[in-house]
Each structure stands twice: as structure tokens, then as C-alpha cells.
């Protein structure tokens, strides 16, 4: 005769308030003859949850038809779960007897706990922008989850980060928990298009983690490089000078031309182009009238980027006597 085993496959069952919980229990033998009852807790004070033969259990239904002769499935469903329902549930086989049935064997128990999904992770970056090669901090927060066990990972462009610190609060028992993590990220010059991702995995998410993202474009400032050049060709008595502002981010930029220290108010031609890495290039052309110029013209291209201190590049204009005397439009 096969020895009876009481099988409760789930050690932990996470349920949501208001939903229905299914507690599984199967037996491996029909013997000894007698009922299977469900209890919550152990010891003399345990609570009877379901008894097929007697009592009124309005929220409990059986998964199988217990009246069927060879039934070996004693699983139950408990509807309208509330926080008061948490605890460990045992299916218990009784041997038929008198004046009472005798407890014969208990299942290992299934702990029912309230599961709450974590909120979507919110990732916040630094308040101010920082230049490449520096480290910035990002925080990730998620709230309202239960049970306490949770996994949080950080990624930058798909690569997992290791420099972060995570805290789950509170440390003691609670209905719900919160997680906060701070990651330290070293900025690269090409990070304008980069993303940091905070990924949260929790048992309630059934293997589908939640993600929060932040764009490094909000945290990075790539300062420009300046180059001022004189075009070799001249148009009539005008020389074209170019100021090339390269590889900057964000787009916010003010460019001014100065001629021998005097700021020029007149309009200048310019173009803005975006690079593949998300940075920008700005080119400004300045036409200098050389017919009335002395030999010592110094042009300055000054750039104020994203509210930072202005940077400038100078160019001492090379105007030959030959150029001054020429009046044709063509450059020799």
C-alpha cells in the first residue's frame, strides 16, 4: 500500500487584494479513508478554513468535485482576498474515526502573502549639466511593492553598471516597500545620445521587469572647440572670415564677432548642423571690408555656450598691399 503524501506545490503564493487565491493540494493515495480539511496556521489555535462535511465557508470553493469517488485533488479557491487572509495554509488529511476523525497527515503548507507590484521606476538625473570625463549621479525610485525582495539593475546603453548603491525601506515588516538606488556614471563625449536605464524585477511582475530611463543629453554639456580661418578667396574688397564652432551640446549658443575689440552688430551668415553623435556644429561667416582697413585688423569670434564663460578665438587678418590695390572681384 502506497504511503499517503500530501502535496502542496507552492511554498509561497502572492495574491492581490480583491482577487481570488487558489491553494493547491493533491494526495497520492485514497487511503486511509477520511476527509481533507484546510487550516490556516498551526497549533491548537489554528483556524479552520474549509471542511467539506460541515460548516459554512462562503468565500471558499473547491477546484475539483470532492464527491467524485477517486478524487485526489483537494485544492481550494478563496475569493475577495483581504489583508486579513495572509498566513500559511495547510491541507490536512484525517482518518475516518469516532468520536472524531483523526488527523493523519499534513501538507507542508503554502504561505499566502499580499503581493503588490512596484510602481514604474522614476529616474532622475543631476540638477546641473556636467562635462565629459566627470561623474554624475542618477537616482531611481520605485514604490508600493510587496514582498520586500526586489532586484534592481542599472544599464548604460545596454551595458550593466556596477557603481551603484541601493536601499529598500523600511527594513522591518511592512505592508509595502520602496526602493531607491543611486548610480554613478562617468560621462563620455559621445553620450549625448546615451541612455541610462533602471530595471526593477519583482515576483509580482512574472519575469517582466519594469524600466525607467533617463537621457544623458539632460546631464551632459559638451563644450565647443573654436577655429577661426580666413578664406583665401576675396569678393571685391571684402575678405570672408569663418568661425567654426564644433562638437558642442546643448544647442544653446551665442556667437559674436569683434573687430579690433569692437563688437560688430551687423548680421552675419551662419549654419547649424547636427553630428551623428548628437552634438552640433555652428559655422559663422564674417565679411570684412578691407578697402578702408589698416594692416593690423584683429577679428575675434566669441562664443558663449549654455550660460558658461565665453570662449574666443582671434585672427589677425592678412591683407596684402596687392590685395588693397586690387579692385576686381576675383582673387588672384
Amino acid at each position: 500500500e502506497e504511503e499517503l503524501q500530501m502535496i502542496q506545490p507552492e511554498k509561497l503564493l502572492l495574491v492581490t487584494v480583491g482577487k481570488t487565491a487558489t491553494l493547491h493540494c493533491t494526495v497520492t493515495s485514497l487511503l486511509p479513508v477520511g476527509p481533507v480539511l484546510w487550516f490556516r496556521g498551526v497549533g491548537p489555535g489554528r483556524e479552520l478554513i474549509y471542511n467539506q462535511k460541515e460548516g459554512h465557508f462562503p468565500r471558499v470553493t473547491t477546484v475539483s468535485d470532492l464527491t467524485k469517488r477517486n478524487n485526489m485533488d483537494f485544492s481550494i479557491r478563496i475569493s475577495s482576498i483581504t489583508p486579513a487572509d495572509v498566513g500559511t495554509y495547510y491541507c490536512v488529511k484525517f482518518r475516518k474515526g469516532s468520536p472524531e476523525n483523526v488527523e493523519f497527515k499534513s501538507g507542508p503548507g503554502t504561505e499566502m502573502a499580499l503581493g503588490a507590484k512596484p510602481s514604474a521606476p522614476v529616474v532622475l538625473g543631476p540638477a546641473a549639466r556636467t562635462t565629459p570625463e566627470h561623474t554624475v549621479s542618477f537616482t531611481c525610485e520605485s514604490h508600493g511593492f510587496s514582498p520586500r525582495d526586489i532586484t534592481l539593475k542599472w544599464f548604460k546603453n545596454g551595458n550593466e553598471l556596477s557603481d551603484f548603491q541601493t536601499n529598500v525601506d523600511p527594513t522591518g515588516q511592512s505592508v509595502a516597500y520602496s526602493i531607491r538606488s543611486t548610480a554613478r556614471v562617468v560621462l563620455d563625449p559621445w553620450d549625448v545620445r546615451s541612455q541610462v536605464i533602471c530595471e526593477v524585477a519583482h515576483v509580482t511582475l512574472q519575469g517582466d521587469p519594469l524600466r525607467g530611463t533617463a537621457n544623458l543629453s539632460e546631464a551632459i554639456r559638451v563644450p565647443p572647440t573654436l577655429e577661426v580661418t580666413q578664406q583665401p578667396m576675396r569678393v571685391g574688397n571684402q575678405v570672408n572670415v569663418t568661425c567654426q564652432v564644433r562638437k558642442f551640446y546643448p544647442q544653446s549658443l551665442q556667437l559674436t564677432w569683434s573687430e579690433n575689440g569692437n563688437v560688430c552688430q551687423r548680421e552675419t551668415a551662419s549654419t547649424l548642423t547636427e553630428n551623428k553623435d548628437g552634438t552640433y556644429n555652428w559655422t559663422s561667416w564674417f565679411l570684412v571690408n578691407i578697402s578702408d582697413q589698416r594692416d593690423d585688423v584683429v577679428l575675434t569670434c566669441q562664443v558663449k555656450h549654455d550660460g558658461q564663460l565665453a570662449v574666443s578665438k582671434r585672427l589677425a587678418l592678412e591683407v596684402t598691399v596687392h590685395q588693397k590695390d586690387q579692385s576686381s572681384d576675383a582673387t588672384p
Epitope: P44, G97, S98, P99, V102, E103, S106
Partner: antibody, heavy 117, light 107 residues
Framework: QVQLVQSGAEVKKPGASVKVSCKAS????????MHWVRQAPGQGLEWMGR????????KYAQKFQGRVTMTRDTSTSTVYMELSSLRSEDTAVYYC??????????WGRGTLVTVSS | DIQMTQSPSSLSASVGDRVTITCRAS??????LAWYQQKPGKAPKLLIY???TLESGVPSRFSGSGSGTDFTLTISSLQPEDFATYYC?????????FGQGTRLEIK
């Protein structure tokens, strides 16, 4: 083999308490409820109560309610019966007995408790 | 509580005799009745359970019958080792109760 081994005889003064042990072996301790039955000298058998070895739940005869305490230690497969406020009429042989479905199919040898001043 | 009354309280019989002991319950116990044999200084020994089922290892000269309130234990041919005290016990409801016993003596 399947047996119930009880602790030895006790002599107690009136008003004292006695604790008798019963160690089960040779079967699954938690699969049978353990009952206690006593027999006064030259008298019949009297049921005192029972303990469920799984939960520790107890049921006592009305006569002994408040004076008797049955406990168990599953780690040693032992049950205990403690009777307090002893009087001379509690002098008896105390048996632990395993209940099958509705009958006592295994008995201990008994423990004689003598209450005498 | 269910009262169990055995009769006779004692009886004398000879080896080879057929002996019948009766047990009456104050209310129906269905067939939840057992019979025990007890010898001096020994624990009771189960003979019959569920009114008529012979316990394993018990000689077939012992038999039980009855249901409801009236039950009998019969020893078809007394053997020397059968001289003892016999108890009936009901397990239909709490508290479990025993008959007062029937002492079987050698004539």
C-alpha cells in the same frame, strides 16, 4: 517494535502535581491521537482526554477540565499528562493509549500514581 | 454522557463453556463499540472493534455482535487464559466511556 513506554511510578502528596510521560516508537507518531485512561485500584477504566500530536490540540473529560494538561514533544515522539491539585482519589494507574479509528489498539504498561499524605 | 452498562458484573464458568457478556448503551452508539480484555496488573487488550470486527491476532473463539444500544461479546469455548475482566467501550461521542467491567472467574 510498535510500543508505548511510560515513565515510572510516582508518590505524591495531596495538592501536588504529577507529570507522566509516554514515549511512542515503531509508528508515525503524528498519525494517531494519544488518549489517557486511568484505573483506580479495583475499579473500571475512566477516559481522561486526548491530544492531537500534530497540532497539540486537546480535548478533556469535563471531570478533569482545569486540572489536567496534555502536551507533546514531536521531536522525541513523547506525550505528557500533568494532573494538578492531587487528592487521594486520584490514586490510580494512568495509561496512555493510541486510538485507532475508534478503539484503543495500543496501550502503555501504565504508571501508578499514589497520592498519600 | 453515554452510560455503558455491562451484565453480568461477574460470572463463573468452566473451561469449554460458551460465555456471553452483554453491554447496553444509554443511547445509540451505532457500531462504534469495542471490547477489551484485562488481566491483573496488565494494560487492557483490544479484542473486538466496530462491534464485530476481530482484532488481528485474537483467537476466533471471540466474537462480537450488535448495533445501536445492545451488544454482546461471546466466547464460544472458554480457555484457561480467558479468565480475566472484560470491558466494553463506546466511541460514538465524547466523552469516551467504558462499561464497569465483567469479571470472568473459573468455576
Amino acid at each position: 517494535q510498535v510500543q508505548l513506554v511510560q515513565s515510572g511510578a510516582e508518590v505524591k502528596k495531596p495538592g501536588a502535581s504529577v507529570k507522566v510521560s509516554c514515549k511512542a516508537s515503531g509508528y508515525t507518531f503524528t498519525s494517531y491521537y494519544m488518549h489517557w485512561v486511568r484505573q483506580a485500584p479495583g475499579q473500571g477504566l475512566e477516559w481522561m482526554g486526548r491530544i492531537n500530536p500534530n497540532s497539540g490540540g486537546t480535548k478533556y473529560a469535563q471531570k478533569f477540565q482545569g486540572r489536567v494538561t496534555m502536551t507533546r514533544d514531536t521531536s522525541t515522539s513523547t506525550v505528557y499528562m500533568e494532573l494538578s491539585s492531587l487528592r487521594s482519589e486520584d490514586t490510580a494507574v494512568y495509561y496512555c493509549a493510541r486510538l485507532g479509528s475508534a478503539y484503543f489498539d495500543l496501550w502503555g504498561r501504565g504508571t501508578l500514581v499514589t497520592v498519600s499524605s | 454522557d453515554i452510560q455503558m452498562t455491562q451484565s453480568p458484573s461477574s460470572l463463573s464458568a468452566s473451561v469449554g463453556d460458551r460465555v456471553t457478556i452483554t453491554c447496553r448503551a444509554s443511547q445509540s452508539v451505532d457500531t462504534w463499540l469495542a471490547w477489551y480484555q484485562q488481566k491483573p496488573g496488565k494494560a487492557p487488550k483490544l479484542l473486538i472493534y466496530e462491534a464485530s470486527t476481530l482484532e488481528s491476532g485474537v483467537p476466533s473463539r471471540f466474537s462480537g455482535s450488535g448495533s445501536g444500544t445492545d451488544f454482546t461479546l461471546t466466547i464460544s469455548s472458554l480457555q484457561p487464559e480467558d479468565f480475566a475482566t472484560y470491558y466494553c467501550q463506546q466511541a460514538n461521542s465524547f466523552p469516551i466511556t467504558f462499561g464497569q467491567g465483567t469479571r470472568l472467574e473459573i468455576k
